[in-house]
């Protein structure tokens, strides 16, 4: 999915005011918040590319993710200012639910969130050359 | 009036630990965006950005030096710590605390006067 | 982590000349068409003083005289007409990628 077109202004809007709080939450209570930057993004629509492939596909221990508050209000706010984005997800979305898994925190999906963390922290950068 | 201050021991022996504490007002730690970042001067050297503490308990670290440093924060009562392992003689320096800002929300800077640390036999 | 690399170490300039320092990052510090880079000047027993934001705007209160380009991994800071009280050490920083870092550093001595 090509992120170019979503509104940025009100993803960044939701992500201020639910997700942050989502992804902080998910994080209390561990120390394990030391990790590298591992992943980066050079724009906006960078950002969310990333931000999706970390947020919704599985990976090398951690399977969990999509299922998260955090992932559930990420979806809704890409679906609903980014146009089309609905329609690529429908497929994602039914083999997910074939491949349920018990919800388990590992270290992996700490550092994963803790990625997620500063990609959006990235995404919502105010620009200058815009202001 | 946005205000850092650092504090220190002054002086202390190799192999201890370093504790530092930064006690700012004028903004909190809590607030979307901010964070504490330390930054050292070593004698005759250039600045050293060592660890940054974010809103979101989000860490970061000198690779050099990231095995010996311990960050942390008591928002609730505006400090940010910093402690550094097995010192030596190469960790003397002035030590500065400032505030950090995601991206450019405001076009300020602000740092303590910072604290001299002395690592001697 | 971000490297930078400062050049010349040191400088001397005449009094109303031209400074220049050069600032090279290991990697691009660009993001959505902002430049993360920042130039500070210090001096002996004093905190950095933020001089340029954002690899080319100045701040409030900095004098004109003091100016800074570049985008990407290449960035400068101008000092014209240089004065006496510019004598101090000059740092560039990035502060697009955690953990944010600090140029080597550029002493400039006026004569």
């Known amino acids: 999915y090509d992120f170019t077109n979503c509104d940025f202004e009100k993803i960044k809007a939701a992500y201020l005011s639910t997700i942050s709080k989502d992804l902080i939450t998910y994080m209390s209570g561990t120390k394990s918040t030391e990790f590298n930057n591992t992943v980066s993004c050079s724009n906006r629509p960078h950002c969310l590319t990333e931000i999706q492939s970390l947020t919704f596909n599985p990976t090398a221990g951690c399977a969990s993710l999509a299922k998260e508050m955090f992932a559930m209000k990420t979806k809704a706010a890409l679906a609903i200012w980014c146009p089309g984005y609905s329609e690529t997800q429908i497929n994602a979305t039914q083999a997910m639910k074939k491949r349920r898994k018990r919800k388990v925190t590992t270290n992996k999906c700490l550092e994963q969130v803790s990625q997620l963390q500063g990609l959006w922290r990235r995404f919502n950068r105010p620009l200058l050359k815009q202001q | 009036q946005v205000t850092l201050k650092e504090s220190g021991p002054g002086i202390l022996q190799p192999s201890q630990t370093l504790s530092l504490t930064c006690s700012f007002s004028g903004f909190s730690l809590s607030t979307y965006g901010m964070g504490i970042g330390w930054i050292r001067l070593p004698s005759g050297k250039g600045l050293e950005w060592l660890a940054s503490i974010w809103w979101d308990d989000n860490r970061y670290f000198n690779a050099a030096l990231k095995s010996r440093l311990t960050i942390s924060k008591d928002a609730s009562k505006n400090q940010v710590f910093l402690k550094i392992a097995s010192v030596d003689t190469a960790d003397t320096a002035t030590y500065y605390c400032?505030?950090?800002?995601?991206?450019?929300?405001?076009?300020?800077?602000?740092w303590g006067q910072g604290t001299l640390v002395t690592v001697s036999a | 982590d971000i490297v930078l690399t400062q050049s010349p170490a040191s400088l001397a300039v005449s009094l109303g000349q031209r400074a220049t320092i050069s600032c090279k990052a290991s990697?691009?510090?660009?993001?959505?068409?902002?430049?993360?880079m920042n130039w500070f000047q210090q001096k002996p027993g004093q905190p950095p003083k933020l001089l340029i934001y954002?690899?080319?705007n100045l701040v409030s209160g900095i004098p004109a005289r003091f100016s800074g380009s570049g985008s990407g991994t290449d960035f400068t800071l101008n000092i014209h007409p240089v004065e006496e009280e510019d004598a101090a050490t000059y740092y560039c920083q990035q502060i697009d990628e955690d953990p944010y870092t600090f140029g080597g550093g550029t002493k400039l001595e006026i004569e």
């Open positions: 400032a505030r950090i800002e995601d991206g450019y929300y405001s076009y300020h800077s602000y």
């Open positions: 990697q691009s510090v660009d993001f959505d068409g902002d430049s993360y």
């Open positions: 954002a690899a080319s």
